[in-house]
């Protein structure tokens, strides 16, 4: 009789342990769901506000034709500037035409005045060729005016209405670029 009671007690204890484990799993699952829900809500909120505004560019970005531009309010070296743009789903500015250059320099004059802004242009150390970040060559009219006398890597920046070059490790503002969202209307 005592053995039977002991066996039942052990079975009950085992069942209790299993229930505790299940409860722990459920709590963990619930927490995970809550976290996912938070992400989803934030994502939906962004999507809805974007859809509601139907704005082709995010807040604080400037639109010109098919592009959105972000003019930074902080200084950083060229490589960090590129990473900062990537976090926002963009790349450093790639100037395709004189019209785009004019728009950028005109906008900068209105916003901040005559400062230095990194763009996505760098000089290959071996060949000395200037290339945009996607590997394409700048059009002849969009080459940096002065050759930097630097033994280090050289990168391009915009100042006033000129493209210039400087040691990539100097600190400057920067400009990011992404595609404008097409209106679905």
């Amino acid at each position: 009789k005592l053995l039977q009671v002991s066996t039942i007690a052990m079975q009950q204890q085992e069942k209790l342990i299993q229930q505790e484990r299940a409860l722990l799993n459920f709590t963990e699952w619930k927490r995970s769901c809550a976290l996912q829900m938070k992400y989803c809500q934030a994502f939906m909120q962004n999507s809805l506000s974007s859809a509601h505004n139907s704005s082709p560019c995010p807040n604080n970005w400037i639109q010109n034709r098919e592009s959105c531009y972000y003019v930074s309010e902080i200084w950083s070296i060229w490589h960090t500037s590129q990473e900062n743009c990537l976090k926002e789903g963009s790349t450093l500015l790639q100037i395709e035409s004189k019209e785009e250059m004019d728009f950028i320099t005109g906008s900068l004059r209105k916003i901040k005045g005559s400062y230095d802004y990194w763009v996505g242009l760098s000089q290959d150390g071996h060949s000395g060729r200037w290339l945009w970040q996607d590997g394409s060559s700048p059009s002849p009219g969009l080459l940096p005016a002065e050759r930097s006398q630097s033994a280090n890597q050289v990168c391009g920046y915009v100042k006033s209405n000129s493209l210039l070059s400087s040691n990539c490790s100097t600190w400057k503002y920067f400009i990011c670029e992404k595609y404008a969202l097409r209106s679905s209307v």
Epitope: Y39, F43, K87, G89, Q133, K178
Partner: nanobody
Amino acid sequence: QVQLQESGGGLVQAGASLRLSCAASGSIFSINAMGWYRQAPGKQRELVAAITNQGRTTYADSVKGRFTISRDNAKNTVYLQMDSLEPEDTAIYYCKGFSPTGDYWGQGTQVTVSS
């Protein structure tokens, strides 16, 4: 959280090609761009190539014209096609997810190019 898993590394001869893959899982909608970094022994980790969700690309000067980054959105995977490999490309290659709230890294895959 976001998990990134690299594959495709290995030992090859100079001039050969390799294709690295980075599979992303988890809360990937927080990721705005994906990139490949590399770290050679005794050197700093450097950005090799990156691609945004819109398909805009960026490359390090040393790999322009040799490496190509691409993505397959259906598979949540980013690829790095490495052609004309040089001994200087020997390094551990890491996949990185760029997000406004933080960055996510993979464990890395070793690429060794022998001369």
